[in-house]
């Protein structure tokens, strides 16, 4: 390389990360194996759980405004879970990104898309519940499944828009020990006349904006909505929280616990540009809190089920039905199950809690399985605990 050839410009914190070398320490190797195992398990669980939630809520339940929110949350979590196997591979090959720059950008973007989408959707759920209680007449007239889908579409668009900088500034950087990092490189595009200033301002802007937009603002909306609802319900003499309240509370708590540490370390990382003493703490902590944030997508489906009564009994029954469906003779399948389409109108008003507590006749195992295999969301809505919790919108 000639003396005049300017090396790829990197921010100091990134260049120092590229200088860190791996050790073949036995205890570190053991931790790495454990991490690969844990992330591999989380990948599998996340994909299965969110896939099941998407299928059950999207195809096996009566569509309401609440099921729409959960459907989109599960979709966001499924996306994040789908990216986890690649992160597991990154860990398995010794913390080196071997999948190229484009995929590095895409993979990271999914993580941030999930971060923004989760925050925005939880805000929408809380505002929706607040409007139901504070403006019941307006809610009765305007709360439709179609409207909820439109809101979700807008929120997804906002999430994508907020993810663009993370896509643009993600890059693959070669470490001096031969490994490859997939990380922020804020000097990648138009570094400006002064790299130090650009590094400081862009890293701070990214950290603060994601903390505000994907964490603080959603939590503020959730908290204020909850306060407004609590005050209104106190006046009405309501005491015990309904099923949906418990579900939302659990999901919000998981969101705060899983994403909170990530944002703390992200802000510390921004400070570490000017304060190198913080860098070792950030380098040690960020991988853990990033994994914790990923695991939020695995935790959510569990929470949907756990916050509903009779969970284990219903779960066992569902599993038995699925097994019966799978183990049935080919000759018994026939052509059943694919003809019946879901009759719920896309603009149907959200059902009252009582409307979904009755038990319509369920299609038998083979019919349900075939309906699923043929891509039909045909079977009648199920009324298990999850359904009841997701449908109890007035609580």
């Amino acid at each position: 390389m000639s003396a005049n050839a300017t090396l790829k410009p990197l921010c100091p914190i990134l260049e120092q990360m590229s200088r860190l070398q791996s050790h073949s320490n036995t205890s570190i190797r053991y931790i790495d194996h454990a991490a690969v195992l844990l992330h591999g398990l989380a990948s599998l669980l996340g994909l299965v759980e969110n896939g099941v939630i998407l299928f059950v809520v999207g195809c096996r339940m009566r569509q309401t405004v609440v099921t729409t929110w959960v459907l989109h949350l599960a979709l966001s979590d499924l996306l994040a879970s789908a990216s986890l196997p690649f992160f597991t591979y990154f860990l398995a090959v010794g913390h080196s990104w071997e999948l190229g720059t484009t995929f590095c950008k895409l993979h990271s973007s999914i993580f941030f898309l999930n971060m923004f989408a989760s925050g925005f959707l939880l805000s929408a759920i809380s505002l929706d519940r607040c409007l139901q209680v504070v403006r019941p007449v307006w809610a009765q007239n305007h709360r439709t499944v179609a409207a909820a889908h439109k809101v979700c579409l807008v929120l997804w668009a906002l999430a994508v828009l907020n993810t663009v900088p993370y896509f643009v500034f993600r890059d693959t950087i070669s470490r001096l020990d031969g490994r490859i990092m997939c990380y922020y490189n804020v000097l990648l595009l138009n570094p400006g006349p002064d790299r130090d200033a650009t590094c400081n301002s862009r890293q701070a802007a990214l950290a603060v904006s994601k903390f505000l937009l994907a964490f603080l603002v959603p939590l503020a909306i959730i908290a204020s909505s909850h306060a407004a609802v609590s005050l209104r319900l106190q006046h009405r003499g309501r005491r015990r929280p309904g099923r949906f309240v418990r579900l939302v509370a659990a999901v919000v708590a998981a969101f705060a616990l899983c994403w909170g540490p990530y944002h703390v370390f992200s802000l510390l990382e921004a400070r570490a540009h000017a304060n190198p003493g913080l860098r070792p703490l950030v380098w040690r902590g960020l991988p853990f809190v990033t994994s914790l944030a990923f695991f939020n997508s695995v935790a959510n489906p569990v929470l949907y089920v756990l916050t509903c009564p009779d969970m284990l009994r219903k779960l066992r029954r569902s599993l038995r039905t699925v097994l019966e469906s799978v183990l049935v003779d080919d000759s018994e399948l026939g052509g059943a199950g694919s003809s019946r389409r879901r009759r719920t109108s896309s603009t149907a008003r959200s059902a009252s809690p009582l409307a979904l507590c009755s038990r319509p006749e369920e299609p038998r195992g083979p019919a349900r399985l075939l309906g699923w295999l043929l891509g039909s969301c045909a079977a009648s809505p199920q009324t298990g605990p999850l359904n009841r919790a997701l449908s109890s919108t007035s609580s």
């Epitope: 100091p12 260049e15 002064d194 790299r195």
Partner: antibody
């Protein structure tokens, strides 16, 4: 070929001021961070100041902070070191050095001698 | 400030000898270390950066190793032109300090 040429050194009385210059050529000056390093006669090396490629950020060790000011003029490909309130212990050969990336001085000038004496 | 302690302060060796110079930092410097060679009346020359990386145009007989607080410069087979003073310098937290130097002399 990369070249760094220091000038402005000389004899100065304690408490006096001096401005050193470093003319750069053979590379894109505005793309590189720059530093000043000094070496007292028969002694080791001491880093004195550092400036970012655009000039917005500067750093100094405690020994010179508040007395020395590093600056640059990218249009003239020149680095400067303004030295005020000079002391006898500031007597040294002053080198300007180019940073390889954010650190590591890969090219040095030939140095200019500053003598602080009454 | 981080203190850099070089040892030995001087050594005598013959052409063809293997020479090792060590540099110890008062705290972990995370591989942010450079080695320089300086000959009398000349400016220093970069040999090694990031603790282990050979600078451009430097002969392969020079190598750097180490981690944490302890770093080493090795000259595998000393050549006549290698008789000089060697300095280590950290680039972790400012101020970036140098070691006091190791003078390699002809035995």
């Amino acid at each position: 070929e990369v070249q760094l040429v220091e000038s402005g050194g000389g004899l100065v009385q304690p408490g006096g001021s001096l401005r050193l210059s470093c003319a750069a050529s053979g590379f894109t000056f505005s793309s590189y961070l720059m530093s000043w390093v000094r070496q007292a006669p028969g002694k080791g090396l001491e880093w004195v100041a550092r400036i970012s490629n655009g000039g917005s950020t500067t750093d100094y060790p405690g020994t010179v902070e508040g007395r020395f000011t590093i600056s640059r003029d990218n249009s003239k490909n020149t680095l400067y070191l303004q030295m005020n309130s000079l002391r006898a212990e500031d007597t040294a050969v002053y080198y300007c050095a180019r940073h390889r990336t954010n650190w590591d001085f890969d090219y040095w000038g030939q140095g200019t001698l500053v003598t602080v004496s009454s | 400030d981080i203190q850099m302690t070089q040892s030995p302060s001087s050594l005598s060796a013959s052409v063809g000898d293997r020479v090792t110079i060590t540099c110890r930092a008062s705290e972990n410097i995370y591989y942010n270390l450079a080695w320089y060679q300086q000959k009398p009346g000349k400016a220093p020359k970069l040999l090694i950066y990031a603790a282990t990386q050979l600078a451009e145009g430097v002969p392969s007989r020079f190598s750097g190793s180490g981690s944490g607080t302890d770093y080493t410069l090795t000259i595998s087979s000393l050549q006549p032109e290698d008789f000089a003073t060697y300095y280590c310098q950290h680039f972790w937290i400012t101020p970036w300090t140098f070691g006091q130097g190791t003078k390699v002399e002809i035995k």
